[in-house]
Protein backbone atom coordinates (compact mmCIF):
# COMPACT_ATOMS: atom_id res chain seq x y z
CA UNK A 1 0.00 0.00 0.00
CA UNK A 2 2.84 2.91 1.00
CA UNK A 3 4.54 1.57 -2.23
CA UNK A 4 1.42 2.76 -4.05
CA UNK A 5 0.55 5.76 -2.53
CA UNK A 6 3.96 6.75 -2.89
CA UNK A 7 3.66 6.62 -6.66
CA UNK A 8 0.21 8.24 -6.54
CA UNK A 9 0.70 10.60 -4.18
CA UNK A 10 3.00 13.62 -5.92
CA UNK A 11 3.24 14.98 -2.12
CA UNK A 12 4.66 11.92 -0.72
CA UNK A 13 8.10 12.75 -1.20
CA UNK A 14 8.09 16.70 1.19
CA UNK A 15 9.93 16.32 3.50
CA UNK A 16 9.04 16.45 7.56
CA UNK A 17 9.27 20.16 8.48
CA UNK A 18 7.46 20.85 5.27
CA UNK A 19 3.89 20.50 3.38
CA UNK A 20 2.75 19.85 -0.10
CA UNK A 21 1.91 22.92 -0.97
CA UNK A 22 -1.63 23.37 -3.63
CA UNK A 23 -1.26 27.08 -3.93
CA UNK A 24 2.11 26.36 -5.90
CA UNK A 25 1.65 23.51 -7.51
CA UNK A 26 2.25 21.22 -5.40
CA UNK A 27 5.39 22.16 -4.41
CA UNK A 28 7.12 21.69 -0.97
CA UNK A 29 7.44 24.51 1.01
CA UNK A 30 8.74 25.32 4.77
CA UNK A 31 6.26 25.18 7.90
CA UNK A 32 5.78 28.83 8.53
CA UNK A 33 6.43 29.99 12.07
CA UNK A 34 5.02 28.57 14.87
CA UNK A 35 4.16 25.45 13.00
CA UNK A 36 5.45 21.81 12.71
CA UNK A 37 5.07 18.94 10.44
CA UNK A 38 6.67 15.50 11.93
CA UNK A 39 6.54 13.77 8.90
CA UNK A 40 7.14 14.03 5.44
CA UNK A 41 4.64 13.68 2.92
CA UNK A 42 1.57 15.90 4.85
CA UNK A 43 -0.27 18.97 3.27
CA UNK A 44 -0.70 21.09 6.22
CA UNK A 45 1.80 22.15 9.19
CA UNK A 46 0.15 21.66 12.59
CA UNK A 47 0.21 24.89 14.69
CA UNK A 48 2.64 24.71 17.52
CA UNK A 49 1.45 23.77 21.13
CA UNK A 50 1.74 26.52 23.22
CA UNK A 51 2.84 26.62 27.18
CA UNK A 52 0.67 29.46 28.88
CA UNK A 53 -0.07 29.99 32.23
CA UNK A 54 0.21 27.13 34.46
CA UNK A 55 2.10 24.94 31.54
CA UNK A 56 5.86 25.85 30.63
CA UNK A 57 7.57 24.99 27.51
CA UNK A 58 10.09 21.81 28.66
CA UNK A 59 10.83 21.31 24.86
CA UNK A 60 10.50 24.47 22.19
CA UNK A 61 8.61 23.76 18.99
CA UNK A 62 10.72 23.26 15.53
CA UNK A 63 10.14 22.85 11.89
CA UNK A 64 9.50 18.69 12.57
CA UNK A 65 8.71 18.66 16.61
CA UNK A 66 5.72 19.90 18.47
CA UNK A 67 6.54 22.18 21.60
CA UNK A 68 6.29 20.01 25.10
CA UNK A 69 5.10 21.34 28.16
CA UNK A 70 5.21 20.74 32.11
CA UNK A 71 4.00 22.26 34.74
CA UNK A 72 4.91 25.33 36.72
CA UNK A 73 6.36 24.43 40.37
CA UNK A 74 3.88 23.58 42.65
CA UNK A 75 1.85 21.61 39.84
CA UNK A 76 2.64 18.27 38.50
CA UNK A 77 1.48 16.81 34.67
CA UNK A 78 -1.61 14.78 34.24
CA UNK A 79 -2.88 12.92 31.17
CA UNK A 80 -1.00 12.11 27.73
CA UNK A 81 1.47 14.57 26.98
CA UNK A 82 1.00 16.49 30.10
CA UNK A 83 -2.24 17.69 28.42
CA UNK A 84 -3.39 19.08 32.75
CA UNK A 85 -1.61 20.61 35.37
CA UNK A 86 -2.40 19.64 38.65
CA UNK A 87 -2.08 21.50 42.29
CA UNK A 88 1.08 19.78 44.53
CA UNK A 89 -0.49 18.58 47.61
CA UNK A 90 2.29 17.89 50.82
CA UNK A 91 2.97 14.46 51.63
CA UNK A 92 0.16 13.18 54.28
CA UNK A 93 -2.51 14.81 52.00
CA UNK A 94 -4.63 14.41 48.84
CA UNK A 95 -6.29 17.08 46.77
CA UNK A 96 -9.96 17.09 46.55
CA UNK A 97 -12.51 19.59 45.00
CA UNK A 98 -11.66 21.85 48.12
CA UNK A 99 -8.40 21.83 48.06
CA UNK A 100 -5.28 19.97 49.54
CA UNK A 101 -6.66 17.73 52.84
CA UNK A 102 -5.17 15.96 55.47
CA UNK A 103 -5.15 11.77 54.97
CA UNK A 104 -7.84 10.15 57.30
CA UNK A 105 -6.58 8.33 60.21
CA UNK A 106 -5.25 4.69 59.15
CA UNK A 107 -4.50 6.23 55.27
CA UNK A 108 -1.48 7.66 54.36
CA UNK A 109 0.40 9.35 51.32
CA UNK A 110 4.10 9.69 50.57
CA UNK A 111 3.93 11.66 47.62
CA UNK A 112 2.63 15.73 46.18
CA UNK A 113 0.59 13.18 44.14
CA UNK A 114 -2.45 10.92 44.18
CA UNK A 115 -4.62 9.73 47.05
CA UNK A 116 -4.81 8.76 50.22
CA UNK A 117 -4.27 4.60 50.88
CA UNK A 118 -4.90 2.52 53.61
CA UNK A 119 -2.08 1.48 55.80
CA UNK A 120 -1.03 -2.05 55.15
CA UNK A 121 -3.11 -4.64 57.73
CA UNK A 122 -0.01 -6.75 58.85
CA UNK A 123 -2.69 -9.49 60.22
CA UNK A 124 -3.62 -10.15 57.08
CA UNK A 125 0.04 -11.83 56.42
CA UNK A 126 0.03 -12.94 60.18
CA UNK A 127 2.67 -10.51 61.13
CA UNK A 128 2.91 -7.17 63.58
CA UNK A 129 3.34 -3.83 63.45
CA UNK A 130 6.77 -3.38 63.77
CA UNK A 131 6.45 0.65 62.87
CA UNK A 132 3.26 2.52 63.20
CA UNK A 133 1.49 4.11 60.07
CA UNK A 134 1.60 7.87 59.72
CA UNK A 135 -0.45 10.32 57.21
CA UNK A 136 3.01 10.15 55.00
CA UNK A 137 3.82 6.78 55.51
CA UNK A 138 2.79 3.33 55.76
CA UNK A 139 3.18 0.86 58.46
CA UNK A 140 6.42 -1.37 59.00
CA UNK A 141 5.32 -5.20 59.21
CA UNK A 142 7.61 -7.29 61.62
CA UNK A 143 7.81 -10.60 62.20
CA UNK A 144 4.68 -12.89 63.17
CA UNK A 145 3.70 -12.24 67.32
CA UNK A 146 4.59 -16.34 67.30
CA UNK A 147 8.13 -15.92 66.36
CA UNK A 148 8.48 -12.81 69.16
CA UNK A 149 7.27 -15.13 71.99
CA UNK A 150 9.87 -15.89 75.01
CA UNK A 151 11.72 -19.08 74.10
CA UNK A 152 10.78 -19.57 70.48
CA UNK A 153 13.60 -19.13 68.42
CA UNK A 154 13.66 -18.93 64.34
CA UNK A 155 17.18 -21.38 64.42
CA UNK A 156 16.55 -24.91 65.16
CA UNK A 157 19.79 -26.42 66.86
CA UNK A 158 21.27 -29.66 65.46
CA UNK A 159 20.35 -33.01 66.69
CA UNK A 160 23.71 -34.27 69.17
CA UNK A 161 25.47 -36.97 67.35
CA UNK A 162 25.66 -40.50 69.06
CA UNK A 163 28.19 -42.60 68.80
CA UNK A 164 27.47 -45.60 67.44
CA UNK A 165 26.23 -48.90 70.12
CA UNK A 166 25.48 -46.32 72.89
CA UNK A 167 21.60 -45.66 73.68
CA UNK A 168 20.71 -42.24 74.99
CA UNK A 169 20.77 -41.82 78.60
CA UNK B 1 7.22 34.19 -7.73
CA UNK B 2 8.78 30.82 -9.13
CA UNK B 3 11.48 31.85 -11.45
CA UNK B 4 13.81 29.02 -13.62
CA UNK B 5 16.39 30.35 -15.69
CA UNK B 6 19.04 28.15 -17.32
CA UNK B 7 22.21 29.01 -19.16
CA UNK B 8 25.44 27.01 -20.50
CA UNK B 9 23.34 26.16 -24.02
CA UNK B 10 25.36 26.08 -27.18
CA UNK B 11 26.96 24.08 -30.34
CA UNK B 12 29.00 21.66 -29.80
CA UNK B 13 30.95 18.64 -31.96
CA UNK B 14 30.15 14.74 -30.91
CA UNK B 15 31.74 13.53 -28.58
CA UNK B 16 32.18 16.98 -26.67
CA UNK B 17 30.93 18.13 -23.14
CA UNK B 18 29.00 21.15 -22.21
CA UNK B 19 27.33 22.28 -18.68
CA UNK B 20 23.74 23.41 -18.28
CA UNK B 21 22.85 25.27 -15.50
CA UNK B 22 19.61 26.44 -13.67
CA UNK B 23 19.22 29.59 -11.31
CA UNK B 24 16.06 28.67 -9.33
CA UNK B 25 14.28 31.70 -6.97
CA UNK B 26 10.60 32.00 -5.77
CA UNK B 27 10.84 29.07 -3.35
CA UNK B 28 12.94 27.17 -0.65
CA UNK B 29 14.65 25.58 -3.32
CA UNK B 30 17.12 23.14 -0.90
CA UNK B 31 13.35 21.34 -0.27
CA UNK B 32 12.70 20.64 -3.67
CA UNK B 33 13.83 18.41 -6.35
CA UNK B 34 14.98 19.64 -9.70
CA UNK B 35 14.71 17.84 -13.03
CA UNK B 36 16.60 18.64 -16.70
CA UNK B 37 13.84 17.70 -19.68
CA UNK B 38 14.61 18.43 -23.62
CA UNK B 39 12.60 18.52 -26.57
CA UNK B 40 13.72 17.85 -29.88
CA UNK B 41 12.56 19.49 -33.00
CA UNK B 42 9.34 17.64 -33.73
CA UNK B 43 9.54 15.06 -30.78
CA UNK B 44 7.50 15.14 -27.43
CA UNK B 45 9.64 16.59 -24.26
CA UNK B 46 11.51 14.29 -22.97
CA UNK B 47 12.73 13.18 -18.86
CA UNK B 48 16.61 13.36 -18.59
CA UNK B 49 17.35 13.59 -14.90
CA UNK B 50 15.99 14.56 -11.50
CA UNK B 51 17.65 15.09 -8.16
CA UNK B 52 15.82 15.16 -4.81
CA UNK B 53 16.40 17.21 -1.92
CA UNK B 54 18.37 14.36 -0.14
CA UNK B 55 20.54 14.47 -3.47
CA UNK B 56 19.15 10.94 -5.02
CA UNK B 57 19.12 10.88 -8.72
CA UNK B 58 17.61 9.42 -11.73
CA UNK B 59 18.41 8.98 -15.25
CA UNK B 60 16.66 8.35 -18.76
CA UNK B 61 18.72 5.02 -20.27
CA UNK B 62 19.73 7.20 -22.96
CA UNK B 63 21.67 9.14 -20.53
CA UNK B 64 22.96 7.10 -18.09
CA UNK B 65 27.16 7.26 -17.66
CA UNK B 66 27.23 10.38 -20.06
CA UNK B 67 24.75 12.81 -17.99
CA UNK B 68 25.63 13.96 -14.63
CA UNK B 69 22.67 15.85 -12.69
CA UNK B 70 24.03 17.92 -9.30
CA UNK B 71 22.88 20.55 -6.86
CA UNK B 72 24.20 23.39 -4.91
CA UNK B 73 21.61 24.35 -2.72
CA UNK B 74 23.75 27.47 -1.29
CA UNK B 75 23.70 28.67 -4.72
CA UNK B 76 20.14 27.76 -5.56
CA UNK B 77 21.63 26.21 -8.62
CA UNK B 78 20.99 22.96 -10.34
CA UNK B 79 23.57 21.45 -13.24
CA UNK B 80 23.54 18.80 -15.52
CA UNK B 81 27.33 17.95 -16.57
CA UNK B 82 26.65 16.06 -20.50
CA UNK B 83 29.75 14.43 -22.16
CA UNK B 84 29.75 12.19 -25.08
CA UNK B 85 27.62 14.33 -26.73
CA UNK B 86 25.91 12.70 -29.72
CA UNK B 87 23.95 13.97 -32.54
CA UNK B 88 20.88 12.71 -30.92
CA UNK B 89 21.23 14.61 -27.68
CA UNK B 90 20.56 17.78 -29.83
CA UNK B 91 17.55 19.64 -28.51
CA UNK B 92 16.42 22.35 -25.81
CA UNK B 93 17.14 21.33 -22.62
CA UNK B 94 14.69 22.54 -19.93
CA UNK B 95 14.86 22.66 -16.04
CA UNK B 96 11.83 21.83 -14.21
CA UNK B 97 10.43 22.48 -10.60
CA UNK B 98 9.44 19.12 -9.57
CA UNK B 99 5.89 18.43 -7.59
CA UNK B 100 6.74 17.16 -3.99
CA UNK B 101 10.03 16.47 -3.93
CA UNK B 102 9.57 13.40 -6.32
CA UNK B 103 12.16 11.92 -8.91
CA UNK B 104 9.92 8.76 -8.90
CA UNK B 105 7.66 9.08 -11.74
CA UNK B 106 7.97 13.23 -11.81
CA UNK B 107 5.43 15.38 -12.73
CA UNK B 108 6.67 19.16 -12.80
CA UNK B 109 5.03 22.34 -11.18
CA UNK B 110 7.24 25.07 -13.11
CA UNK B 111 8.98 24.94 -16.44
CA UNK B 112 11.88 27.60 -17.09
CA UNK B 113 12.54 28.86 -20.72
CA UNK B 114 14.89 26.39 -21.99
CA UNK B 115 18.30 26.75 -23.49
CA UNK B 116 19.23 25.26 -26.67
CA UNK B 117 21.99 22.50 -27.43
CA UNK B 118 23.16 21.51 -30.87
CA UNK B 119 25.42 18.85 -31.24
CA UNK B 120 26.89 18.50 -34.95
CA UNK B 121 30.26 17.79 -36.66
Known amino acids: FERTRSLQDPCSNCPAGTFCDNNRNQICSPCPPNSFSSAGGQRTCDICRQCKGVFRTRKECSSTSNAECDCTPGFHCLGAGCSMCEQDCKQGQELTKKGCKDCCFGTFNDQKRGICRPWTNCSLDGKSVLVNGTKERDVVCGPSPADLSPGASSVTPPAPAREPGHSPQ | EVQLVESGGGEVQPGGSLRLSCAAS????????MGWYRQAPGKRREFVAA???????VYAESVKGRFTISRDNAKNTVYLQMSSLRAEDTAVYYC???????????????WGQGTLVTVKP
Open chain 2, 96 to 110: GLLKGNRVVSPSVAY
Open chain 2, 51 to 57: IESGRNT
Open chain 2, 26 to 33: GFSFSINA
